[in-house]
Interface confidence: medium
C-alpha cells in the first residue's frame, strides 16, 4: 500500500479512474441516484423523478420523460404496481418505450452501488 501511494503516477491514475467512473455514471444516468439505504432520500428522488417524467411527457419530450420514469421505477419498492399504473396512464407507444429501457434498470442500480463502494482511496 505504501509502495502504491509513493508511486508518482498513482494519484494521476486514480484521478483518471474517477473521471472515467463519473463519465460512466453520467452516461448511465446515475449521477443523481440517491443513497438506496436512505429511505427519505429515495422517497424524495422517487417523487421528483415521477414529477419530472410527467412534466416532460406533457411537453412532448417522451424520451427524457421516460428516462425519469425509469429512474423512479428503479428505486420503487413496488415496481409491478407502478408499472400497472403507468400502463393505464401512458399512451401505448410511450409505455413500450419505457419497457425497452427497463432491462437496464437493475444493472444501473448494481453499477451505482459498486461504483460507490469502489470509490475509496
Amino acid at each position: 500500500d505504501r509502495k502504491r501511494r509513493s508511486d508518482p503516477n498513482f494519484k494521476n491514475r486514480l484521478r483518471e479512474r474517477r473521471k472515467k467512473q463519473k463519465l460512466a455514471k453520467e452516461r448511465a444516468g446515475l449521477s443523481k441516484l440517491p443513497d438506496l439505504k436512505d429511505a427519505e432520500a429515495v422517497q424524495k428522488f422517487f417523487l421528483e423523478e415521477i414529477q419530472l417524467g410527467e412534466e416532460l411527457l406533457a411537453q412532448g419530450d417522451y424520451e427524457k420523460g421516460v428516462d425519469h420514469l425509469t429512474n423512479a421505477i428503479a428505486v420503487c419498492g413496488q415496481p409491478q404496481q407502478l408499472l400497472q399504473v403507468l400502463q393505464q396512464t401512458l399512451p401505448p407507444p410511450v409505455f413500450q418505450m419505457l419497457l425497452t429501457k427497463l432491462p437496464t434498470i437493475s444493472q444501473r442500480i448494481v453499477s451505482a452501488q459498486s461504483l460507490a463502494e469502489d470509490d475509496v482511496e
Partner: nanobody
Framework: AVQLVESGGGLVQAGGSLRLSCVAS????????MGWYRQAPGKQRVLVAT???????NYADSVKGRFTISRDNTKNTVYLQMNSLKPEDTSVYYC????????????????WGQGTQVTVSS
C-alpha cells in the same frame, strides 16, 4: 419546479381597487390549478380564489362579487382583480399553483410565491 412571482400589491384606500399578477415559470402552466390565498398577521393562510386549467373559478364567500380571478395561459399569468377593497382585506397575498399527479393519484404538486402585501386603509 415551478417559480411563482407576484406583483401589484400596495397601499390603497377603502373602496379602491388593485390588480395582482402572478407569473409562473419552469413548467407547463396550463396544467395547473392556480389560486390566490391570503394571510393576515397572526392568522392562518386562507383561500381567496382559484381557477382551474379549464377556467372554472371558485371564491371565498368574503370576496364574492368584489374579486375576480382570471388567467392567461399564453402569458403564464394569473390575475386577481380586487374591487371595493375593505380594511379587512389587508393581508399578504400568495399565489399558488397546484397539480395532481396522473401517475400517483395521491400525489399533488404544490407551489407558492413569496407573497405581495396589500394594505387597505380606512
Amino acid at each position: 419546479a415551478v417559480q411563482l412571482v407576484e406583483s401589484g400589491g400596495g397601499l390603497v384606500q377603502a373602496g379602491g381597487s388593485l390588480r395582482l399578477s402572478c407569473v409562473a415559470s419552469g413548467s407547463t402552466f396550463s396544467n395547473f390549478v392556480m389560486g390566490w390565498y391570503r394571510q393576515a398577521p397572526g392568522k392562518q393562510r386562507v383561500l381567496v380564489a382559484t381557477i382551474s386549467s379549464g377556467g372554472s373559478t371558485n371564491y371565498a364567500d368574503s370576496v364574492k362579487g368584489r374579486f375576480t380571478i382570471s388567467r392567461d395561459n399564453t402569458k403564464n399569468t394569473v390575475y386577481l382583480q380586487m374591487n371595493s377593497l375593505k380594511p379587512e382585506d389587508t393581508s399578504v397575498y400568495y399565489c399558488n399553483a397546484r397539480r395532481g399527479s396522473v401517475i400517483v393519484p395521491t400525489l399533488a404538486y404544490d407551489y407558492w410565491g413569496q407573497g405581495t402585501q396589500v394594505t387597505v386603509s380606512s
